[in-house]
Amino acid sequence: MENFQKVEKIGEGTYGVVYKARNKLTGEVVALKKIRLDTETEGVPSTAIREISLLKELNHPNIVKLLDVIHTENKLYLVFEFLHQDLKKFMDASALTGIPLPLIKSYLFQLLQGLAFCHSHRVLHRDLKPQNLLINTEGAIKLADFGLARAFGVPVRTYTHEVVTLWYRAPEILLGCKYYSTAVDIWSLGCIFAEMVTRRALFPGDSEIDQLFRIFRTLGTPDEVVWPGVTSMPDYKPSFPKWARQDFSKVVPPLDEDGRSLLSQMLHYDPNKRISAKAALAHPFFQDVTKPVPHLRL
């Protein structure tokens, strides 16, 4: 740790405080994440160390690079490449100006490329949200904290006791499915796509049941026809209200037909029928994709 000079605190992630730091030997600017674990008194679990070490091999232009893992004095520090801003901040800064559609399209395309790569290596994110999508001034967007959920779990609250957001959580997780797939990341990305277009969260639930019911009110209450096996899921209740599906043109009105088609496939209830990242990249919505540069208010 003595090789790094902390420049400033840049955020408070799910697992601990995040600093902008400089490598004293190379001058490289990095993001330094101190991981706080419940088990800190007994040290960092060896399983977590193994999981994290595997993530160092995950090299892709749309994945935030894990540069180093520093395990000292029962504490764990993760050294990542540094990017200028997260998507949550960028969307907030764009609340009145909007994010231009070509940039939304570019961001979605890049994120799908990152997901396709990770999913092909059987690595899931599990906790995609605007806060862990990072952008730079050149128009790139990258997935951060990939695989950390498997290593450390997804807590109900952060280390600062903030509630971990449910807004981007797939319905199969909310319904208690223990063995979920890469499709959970596609759902999350679909929610983020809709949010970039409409400038508001698609399903801003404040509890697990509120989250589920917000999804049901928009997409209709799922049944065995649209999602075989749903009624057998651990947290499914036959008493769930039966809401009808809304027309997608009412859900994301500013989005064109291709965009709505892609989004509806990303938000398919049945994880087995939900579009894959690889298939999504071939969707007609991306036939005119470019890579515009964002106007960042840093």
Epitope: K88, D92, A95, T97, G98, T198, R199, P253, P254
Partner: antibody, heavy 117, light 106 residues
């Protein structure tokens, strides 16, 4: 029920200052971007300024840039517009409005600002 | 900056008439176009958002259409309470209002 109540308007001399307030109730104020829109007597609507919800990014129409400052106090559920170096052409009814994504869904009743010597 | 041009600026019509107001943007704004109704001494009221979506509580005689640069607001059968001023507004990038269309009783 969503309510927005503007206050702070009145008569002020050219070059003077005024601070408008907008008290919000009936919704989670901190979750919404907010805007000020004005309407000169007998004229159309003109967007003046806006502020984002979470980080408080601010935006201004060119006509008020450098003279007006928008701010919010989420703990008090209140939106503000500090108006300095006022001109006769700033005379208008000032409305505060809630921004719901990409449209303004709720508006206050307005407060009249008159700039005259 | 995006300019919005509304036409006509004023319009006389009778109860029961079908009325159309048009709005043109100086550049493409996709479907980021909203319509508001304002009565004298009152605050504007949202009618239509995203070019064609009816705001909750607004009568179905109001409808909107268009995409890109050209948009229309249609009132299928005018009611006495519809006589007011109507404004279009783009929200593609910041906000710009049209100059308004005053709908008067013939």
């Amino acid at each position: 029920e969503v309510q927005l109540l503007e206050s702070g308007g009145g008569l002020v001399q050219p070059g003077g200052s005024l601070r408008l307030s907008c008290a919000a109730s009936g919704f989670t104020f901190s979750s919404y971007a907010m805007s000020w829109v004005r309407q000169a007597p007998g004229k159309g609507l003109e967007w003046v300024s806006g502020i984002s919800s979470y980080y408080g990014y601010t935006y201004y129409a060119d006509s008020v840039k450098g003279r007006f400052t928008i701010s919010r106090d989420n703990s008090k559920n209140t939106l503000y517009l500090q108006m300095n170096s006022l001109r006769a052409e700033d005379t208008a009814v000032y409305y505060c409005a809630r921004v719901y994504g990409y449209y303004m869904d709720y508006w206050g009743q307005g407060t009249l600002v008159t700039v005259s010597s | 900056d995006i300019q919005m041009t509304q036409s006509p600026s004023s319009l006389s019509a009778s109860v029961g008439d079908r009325v159309t107001i048009t709005c043109r943007a100086s550049q493409s704004i996709s479907s980021y176009l909203n319509w508001y109704q304002q009565k004298p001494g009152k605050a504007p009221k949202l009618l239509i958002y995203a070019a064609s979506s009816l705001q909750s509580g607004v009568p179905s005689r109001f409808s909107g259409s268009g995409s890109g640069t050209d948009f229309t607001l249609t009132i299928s059968s005018l009611q006495p309470e519809d006589f007011a001023t109507y404004y279009c507004q783009q929200s593609s990038s910041l906000y710009t209002f049209g100059q308004g269309t005053k709908l008067e009783i013939k």
